[in-house]
Interface confidence: medium
């Protein structure tokens, strides 16, 4: 921002009424009126170019310093070319000297040269040559000097003529301030520019109404340079929650809008399924039946728990059940749906029921499922099972109601035995099998059926209470089809799959484990 100038003295604006002191009195400097651009202007002028040894002083009135530390002196003046005078005026000069003196009081007409300190010799960039003078072309020069730091109550300026033909048309003395400034939603007060050129005065800003320094952010600061310019902004303020930046201020969010944190972003429209917000809202409340999960951003629409899984099937396969379902028709507006499967088993004889999580095995953990199917195994035969699939999302925990669907299935058969070939010879096959331990108590006997491969007319059956059998009197180097089935009080259990086992050829005789 441009520096603000506070004028302490303005000769040109005073209309010749300042009454500056001349020394020696009545000689040298003289107040004159002229006409420029059809306007009367006043000037202090001296033109004793022929006399030699000039020492003419012009002193300003006493100027109250006020709060100024460094003053700037702007001079507008014209100097005639010494060659424009007859004989070149050998004693003629083309410069004058600028002085100042500080004091705590006005000395009035008591003028003492010794109190004055020289600021500089003032030389023109352009002198007024004869042709310009005759044509009334005033070659106006502008020079600026500065003095500081000033410490006394006031000061004088003085102009020493040493034999020039010079006219002072304007003497303006001012100091600079960094103007009041709003930047980055921070207010910086009007600040007096410092007196030392290299130094920058650090000025703390204050956040405008409804603005705050963001967490972890720097407090707003700026630097007021000696020329009255603000430099090096540091930190900033942001409009607080419920307010947005409009030009250089923070304005409350309009009804129906909200802003949930201090940020540079504008207010946002209330999302879906929220109630209309009042002015200055930091969030928008959810409609009845809709909720916001703790981790949901305020900009997200309010959501609700999902409906139940749309369609659930339970397909029994021996002592296993495959559960399949489709996603809820209403997701509640969320994508974070997970499923939980629970199991209940009932004994047909007694009608007694209880949880069965401990006795069954799931193909994957039954809680927090993201897929829409699961296989449950290790089910007991001749037992009724009820499976519940519950759909949940991020807001389900905020309500007491649950969204679930159930499917029941009766297990009538044991699980097919898993069959292994333990050993073989040219005339025998040793076979073993296993079934899940929970089902073993219900098995009365195991029935082993076997026949030559390719012979569909005859087969042999062996029954045993154990988990293995050796089949004898077999033909060498022959493939047999073997199946094992559990027998329960209620009837036959599920049969194993049919296995092909081959006896050894006579050349490779001897028992060999496989």
């Amino acid at each position: 921002a441009q520096g603000k100038e506070v004028v302490l003295l303005d000769f040109a604006a005073a209309g010749g009424e300042l009454g500056w002191l001349t020394h020696p009195y009545g000689k040298g400097w003289d107040l004159m009126q002229n006409i420029m651009n059809d306007m009367p202007i006043y000037m202090y002028s001296v033109c004793n170019v022929m006399s030699g040894d000039q020492d003419n002083w012009l002193r300003t009135n006493w100027v109250y310093r006020g709060e100024a530390e460094r003053i700037f002196i702007e001079l507008k003046f014209t100097v005639r070319d010494c060659n424009s005078f007859p004989g070149g005026a050998s004693s003629c000069k083309e410069t004058f000297n600028l002085y100042y003196a500080e004091s705590d009081l006005d000395y009035g007409t008591n003028f003492q040269k010794r109190l004055f300190t020289k600021i500089d010799t003032i030389a023109p960039d352009e002198i007024t040559v004869s042709s310009d003078f005759e044509a009334r072309h005033v070659k106006l020069n502008v020079e600026e000097r500065s003095v500081g730091p000033l410490t006394r109550k006031g000061f004088y300026l003085a102009f020493q003529d040493i034999g020039a033909c010079v006219a002072l048309l304007s003497v303006r003395v001012y100091y600079k301030k960094c103007p009041e400034l709003l930047q980055g939603l921070a207010h910086f007060p009007e600040t007096i520019a410092g007196s030392d050129a290299p130094s920058l005065a650090t000025v703390a800003g204050t956040c405008v109404d409804h603005a705050v320094v963001p967490p972890g952010g720097e407090e707003p600061r700026m630097h007021c340079a000696v020329d009255g310019e603000w430099l090096v902004p540091i930190g900033q303020c942001l409009c607080q929650a419920g307010y947005e930046k409009v030009e250089d201020a923070c304005q409350a969010c309009s009804p129906g809008f909200f802003k949930f944190e201090a940020s540079e972003s504008p207010c946002l429209e209330c999302p879906e399924h929220t109630l209309p917000s009042p002015e200055g809202a930091t969030s928008c409340e959810c409609e009845e039946g809709f909720f916001r999960a703790p981790q949901d951003p305020a900009s997200m629409p309010c959501t609700r728990p999902p409906s139940a899984p749309h369609y659930l099937t339970a397909v029994g396969m021996g002592a296993k059940v495959e559960l399949r379902w489709t996603p809820p028709q209403d997701s509640g507006g969320r994508e974070d749906i997970v499923y939980s499967v629970t199991c209940e088993q009932c004994w047909p004889e007694s009608g007694e029921c209880g949880p069965c999580e401990a006795s069954v095995r799931y193909s994957e953990p039954p809680h927090g499922l993201t897929r829409t199917s699961v296989t449950v195994s290790d089910l007991e035969p001749h037992m009724n099972y009820t499976f519940t699939v519950e759909a949940r999302n991020g807001v389900s925990g905020l309500v007491t109601s649950r969204s679930f669907r159930t499917a029941s299935v009766s297990i009538n058969q044991t699980e097919p035995p898993k069959v292994r070939l333990e050993g073989r010879s040219t005339t025998s096959l040793s076979v073993s099998w296993s079934i899940p331990p929970p089902q073993q108590s219900r098995v009365w006997k195991y029935e082993v059926t076997y026949r030559k491969k390719g012979d569909s007319n005859s087969y042999n059956v062996r029954r045993t209470e154990g988990f293995s059998v050796t089949l004898d009197d077999l033909a060498p180097d022959t493939t047999y089809l073997v199946q094992v089935q559990a027998l329960t009080q209620e009837g036959q259990g599920a049969g194993s799959k049919v296995h092909e086992f081959q006896t050894l050829s006579p050349e490779g005789s001897g028992n060999l484990a496989v």
Epitope: M32, Q33, N34, I35, P40, M43, S45, V46, C47, N48, V49, M50, T78, V79, R80, S84, F85, P86, T128, S130, S131, F133, E134, A135, R136, V138, C165, V166, A167, L169
Partner: antibody, heavy 128, light 107 residues
Framework: EVQLLESGGGLVQPGGSLRLSCAAS????????MAWVRQAPGKGLEWVSR????????HYADSVKGRFTISRDNSKNTLYLQMNSLRAEDTAVYYC?????????????????????WGQGTLVTVSS | DIQMTQSPSSLSASVGDRVTITCRAS??????LAWYQQKPGKAPKLLIY???NLHTGVPSRFSGSGSGTEFTLTISSLQPDDFATYYC?????????FGQGTKVEIK
């Protein structure tokens, strides 16, 4: 010694024309502003026109504007006044006058000039 | 235009007298004023410029003063050669105007 010598005056009928000349010597003519000043018989002085050292700018009194033309030839050290559409009230002694700003010890020139040097004058009579 | 009014229009004085002639401007002309002396049948001669500056070769008994609208020409001790008509002229405006003249006669 500065000398200004006017010529070209005489009797002329109303509506007629006349050209006055002023021969300069004894000074650097091209440094001087030159002017014509007239004086009606038994009356005071009246400024007529001026011309800058190098031929411009020119200014005229309202009473002669559009009828009189001032000019100069610095190579001949001569000032001229061409007078057209003459009227009876133009009857006067016409003086040529000069001003050298180099002798005026002021930092800023006056808005206009005064007259340091004068010729002896030439009489112009406009009559039918 | 700026009007210049001289007073008196004529005066009678004796050799050795102090003579003062006044010139008034219709508006402020600062110090842009000149005084001339004219004898019958002769061209005017410059006496004073810039209200108070004596032209080269003019006797020091002549002096000028004033600024703004009021100006005076003073002859401190009238000499026989001083009997003439005196004119003031303003040169603040390009339409330079003269006063109507003051005739100084022998008493």
């Amino acid at each position: 010694e500065v000398q200004l010598l006017e010529s070209g005056g005489g009797l002329v009928q109303p509506g007629g024309s006349l050209r006055l000349s002023c021969a300069a010597s004894g000074f650097t003519f091209s440094h001087y502003m030159m002017a014509w000043v007239r004086q009606a018989p038994g009356k005071g002085l009246e400024w007529v026109s001026r011309i800058g050292p190098s031929g411009g700018p020119t200014h005229y009194a309202d009473s002669v504007k559009g009828r009189f033309t001032i000019s100069r030839d610095n190579s001949k050290n001569t000032l001229y006044l061409q007078m057209n559409s003459l009227r009876a009230e133009d009857t006067a002694v016409y003086y040529c006058a000069g001003y050298d700003s180099g002798y005026d010890y002021v930092a800023v020139a006056g808005p206009a000039e005064y007259f340091q040097h004068w010729g002896q004058g030439t009489l112009v009579t406009v009559s039918s | 235009d700026i009007q210049m009014t001289q007073s008196p229009s004529s005066l009678s004085a004796s050799v050795g007298d102090r003579v003062t002639i006044t010139c008034r401007a219709s508006q402020s002309i600062s110090t842009w004023l000149a005084w001339y002396q004219q004898k019958p049948g002769k061209a005017p001669k410059l006496l004073i410029y810039k209200a108070s500056n004596l032209h080269t070769g003019v006797p020091s008994r002549f002096s000028g003063s004033g600024s703004g609208t009021e100006f005076t020409l003073t002859i401190s001790s009238l000499q026989p050669d001083d009997f003439a008509t005196y004119y003031c002229q303003q040169y603040q405006s390009y339409s330079r105007t003269f006063g109507q003249g003051t005739k100084v006669e022998i008493k």
